[in-house]
Interface confidence: low
């Protein structure tokens, strides 16, 4: 806390500019009007203030807006955002995607901080659902964002948003999350033709039920082993040897290398040896 002192003669700030970088903390407190700061927030980031000076500027904004900053100020916080606590951010009402992007840009290149997590939470809750533009933005900054959500939170993702999801966005999702996302993806991509559909749905197949895998096996999709290994074990077990052969196409030979790993191991144990022998891979049930 900077103690209240009168502003020295001739030092009252008429605008937020470079001259302020040499003001001591108490001078900033005494000579910079909070309302002026709020209207010229966009200039702060172009001025080389020290961390200590930024603390004073934040304190002034906190006094001006004890109930939380208006979006007009939030949008121009820039690196002052890094000074905010999650408690500060919980007071905000952020509705503009441009504001969200501006603040995510500040944190770019860093891990998701508690501040960013709180900001995203406030934004998504304010919108009521995770729409495509928001998801597009969030996954661009944080590829792992989608998989950081609970299945309950993912249930608010509309199928139309699934178009924004890239394969790498699902890398860290667990089966429970894919169980929620897969039906949405199936709905989103339902009007695509066979080969295009498979390219889009492939990343989501960890949530696919047996009947969908059976249907895919009839479409010459040539699923790679990496995708096959991510399928739900309970969905793979009922598949016949013939169906797995059709599903994998030329990749079926890869089963040998994975015979000790789930779901391949469990699937092999469910098959008749005669059927396995038709693959000519030496798999032992």
């Amino acid at each position: 806390e900077v103690e209240k002192t009168a502003c020295p003669s001739g030092k009252k700030a008429r605008e937020i500019d470079e001259s302020l970088i040499f003001y001591k903390k108490w001078e900033l407190e005494a000579c910079v009007d909070a309302a002026l700061l709020a209207t010229q927030m966009d200039r702060v980031n172009a001025i080389p203030f020290t961390y200590e000076q930024l603390d004073v500027l934040k304190h002034k904004l906190d006094e001006l807006y004890p109930q939380g900053y208006p979006e007009s100020v939030i949008q121009h916080l820039g690196y002052l955002f890094l000074k905010m606590s999650p408690e500060d951010i919980r007071k905000w009402n952020v509705t503009s995607l441009e504001t969200l992007k501006a603040l995510l840009e500040v944190n770019k290149g860093h891990e998701m901080s508690p501040q960013v997590a709180t900001l995203i939470d406030r934004f998504v809750k304010g919108r009521g659902q995770l729409d495509k533009d928001t998801l597009d933005t969030l996954t661009a900054f944080y590829p792992g964002y989608l998989c950081s959500l609970s299945p309950e939170e993912l249930s608010s993702v509309p199928p139309s948003s699934i178009w924004a999801v890239r394969p790498q966005d699902l890398d860290t999702c667990d089966p429970r999350q894919l169980d929620v996302l897969y039906p949405k993806a199936r709905l989103a991509f339902q009007n695509m033709n066979g080969s295009e559909y498979f390219v889009k749905i492939q990343s989501f197949l960890g949530g696919a039920p047996t009947e969908d895998l059976k249907a895919l096996s009839q479409q010459n999709v040539s699923m790679d082993l990496a995708t096959f290994m991510k399928l739900r074990t309970d969905a793979v077990l009922p598949l016949t040897v013939a169906e797995v052969q059709k599903l994998l196409g030329p990749h079926v030979e890869g089963l040998k290398a994975e015979e000790r790993h789930r779901p391949v191991r469990d699937w092999i144990l469910r098959q008749r040896q005669d059927d396995l022998d038709t693959l000519g891979l030496g798999l032992q049930g």
């Epitope: 980031n45 172009a46 001025i47 080389p48 020290t50 961390y51 820039g78 690196y79 500040v106």
Partner: nanobody, 129 residues
Amino acid sequence: QVKLVESGGGSVQAGGSLRLSCAASGYTYSYGYMGWFRQAPGKEREGVAKIYNGDGSTYYADSVKGRFTISQDRRNNTLYLQMNSLAPEDTGMYYCATNRLPNSDVDLVLPRFGRFGYWGQGTQVTVSS
């Protein structure tokens, strides 16, 4: 890692001159501010002079204007502070600092932002009357 090493401090009579140097290393991204700060015993640290090495713009505290000159040798990554007409109130520890970052893609958004996150160990300047 960004490293800043100051030198050139010392004791001098009032009215004398000193030239401080700051050797910087560890950058992959060249734009940002470098500056000189000082701290007298028991006082708050204050900015003395800063330079934006994108366009060479310089900024000075009122108390040193016309007496101190900040400059840089970009080829050798060295910052200087030429101090003339020194007075006893200029006594203190002088620190070199920068907001240039070691990670080239982090600071591209607002390269002029002044987070002076990297500091040297300081060099002592003593001016006696």
